[in-house]
């Protein structure tokens, strides 16, 4: 309980730059006072801070920076040299990944079966963090440029590009404006919208003979 | 529906070996650093261990060291604790557990729990 | 290790109650709190993560605060599904610790 990481920030984008720090409080009472705090990315080589000062209360601080974050999730150790080994300190997760892209292709078909529109999209590239895609909506006129009442959002579940909207939050034969939002930690993005009447998208089932 | 289910546990006599599994679903398995978890009947919590999204890097309690071994297979959702040398102190609760990211650790999804009971 | 010490360990309340429940760790460990729901044979919740932050799902009633050493999770006006056990974690320092707990019971 001597030791403590901070990250900065400790979610970032792949490829970007991560700075941490190692304190060591003054009261611990296992370790010398000129102690060297060390390093440690995942497996790889353990490696000394790019500097290591003492603040006023007797702390003693390291200090990195990660040029490259080149994992999409990864533990950082702060270690000090124990014996003929090494003592942890702490660990701190890191997590990197990328925005999501504007979810593309997006179309809906009214399905009368189960009353409902059913809409679908595809997601864009991986992103490597948990990403949310909503399927947003109001209702409008013809060409969608008005925004009229707001249908409740539709939540998309984990690793489905689809979401359907119930027959009684539609207005059959009235336009309403449909997009895809996708969000992240790392920002959002949105769809292009899709203008349309839920009856000009019926999904006709074949006849039953 | 986001979950974690464990299984495994039972009644084994000290010096013996259990290996728990813990199936996820609802979730990107492979984006989430997993830990273990233990409470024994009656009493709080304590950490056991934990492995990043790889396999690569596996941490343990002192309690356990030497002993447990964490692993996990990403195809198969599926996190796993070998447990060899059982004592009667190791008898608890044993949860997987995933960590919010962007938070330190907090857990926002819990198995239900898989009993560990060591007893001759 | 950062010792965590709740208190009360036990507390008998009414529903409707406003409820507190204290943590202490050992030493300073900033924001680096977060804390937990047990109901009896269940898995814990998540309720309230860097000591002030209120997981997503869970009441606006239960609320988090403090920083350091001293933490409280508040509970504004106990509900019948609040009478449980309650965790606090520390996530500051290796290994991360929890609290004995402190058991919410009907008066």
């Known amino acids: 309980s001597c030791g403590h990481i901070e990250i900065s920030p400790p979610v970032v984008r792949l490829g970007d730059p991560v700075l941490a720090s190692c304190t060591i409080s003054p009261n611990c009472s296992k370790l010398d006072q000129q102690a060297k705090i060390l390093w440690r990315l995942q497996d790889e080589p353990i490696q000394p801070g790019d500097r290591q000062h003492h603040l006023p209360d007797g702390t003693q601080e390291s200090l990195i920076t990660l040029p490259h974050l080149n994992y999409t999730q990864a533990f950082l150790f702060c270690l000090v040299p124990w014996e003929d080994s090494v003592q942890l300190l702490d660990q701190a997760e890191l997590h990197a990944g990328y925005p999501p892209a504007s979810p593309s292709n997006l179309s809906c078909l009214m399905h009368l079966t189960t009353n409902s529109l059913v809409c679908q999209w595809e997601p864009g590239p991986e992103t490597h963090l948990p990403t949310s895609f909503i399927l947003k909506s109001f209702r409008s006129r013809a060409d969608c440029q008005y925004q009229g009442d707001t249908i409740p959002d539709c939540v998309a579940k984990k690793r489905q590009n689809n979401c359907s909207i119930p027959r009684k939050n539609l207005l059959l034969y009235q336009y309403m404006a449909i997009w895809v939002q996708a969000e992240n930690m790392l920002g959002s993005s949105e769809s292009p919208k899709l203008c349309l009447d839920p009856m000009d998208v019926v999904k006709l089932e074949p006849p039953m003979l | 529906e986001v979950q974690l289910l464990e299984s495994g546990g039972g009644l084994v006599q000290p010096g013996g070996s259990l290996r728990l599994s813990c199936a996820a679903s609802?979730?990107?398995?492979?984006?989430?650093a997993m830990w273990w978890v233990r409470q024994a009947p009656g009493k709080g919590l304590e950490w056991v261990s934990?492995?990043?999204?790889?396999?690569?890097?596996?941490l343990y309690a002192d309690s356990v060291k030497g002993r447990f071994t964490i692993s996990r297979d990403n195809s198969k959702n599926t996190l796993y604790l070998q447990m060899n040398s059982l004592r009667a102190e190791d008898t608890a609760v044993y949860y997987c557990?995933?960590?919010?990211?962007?938070?330190?650790?907090?857990?926002?999804?819990w198995g239900q729990g898989t009993m560990v009971t060591v007893s001759s | 290790d950062i010792q965590m010490t709740q208190s009360p360990s036990s507390l008998s309340a009414s529903v409707g109650d406003r409820v507190t429940i204290t943590c202490r760790a050992s030493q300073s460990i900033s924001s680096y709190l977060n804390w937990y729901q047990q109901k009896p044979g269940k898995a814990p919740k998540l309720l309230i993560y860097a000591a002030s932050s209120l997981q997503s799902g869970v009441p606006s009633r239960f609320s988090g605060s403090g920083s350091g050493t001293d933490f409280t999770l508040t509970i504004s006006s106990l509900q019948p599904e609040d009478f449980a056990t309650y965790y606090c974690?520390?996530?500051?320092?290796?290994?991360?610790?929890f609290g004995q707990g402190t058991k919410v019971e009907i008066k």
């Open positions: 974690q520390q996530s500051y320092s290796t290994p991360r610790t």
């Open positions: 934990l492995i990043d999204v790889s396999g690569g890097v596996q």
């Open positions: 609802g979730f990107t398995f492979s984006y989430y």
């Open positions: 557990a995933k960590p919010l990211i962007g938070t330190r650790d907090a857990f926002d999804i």
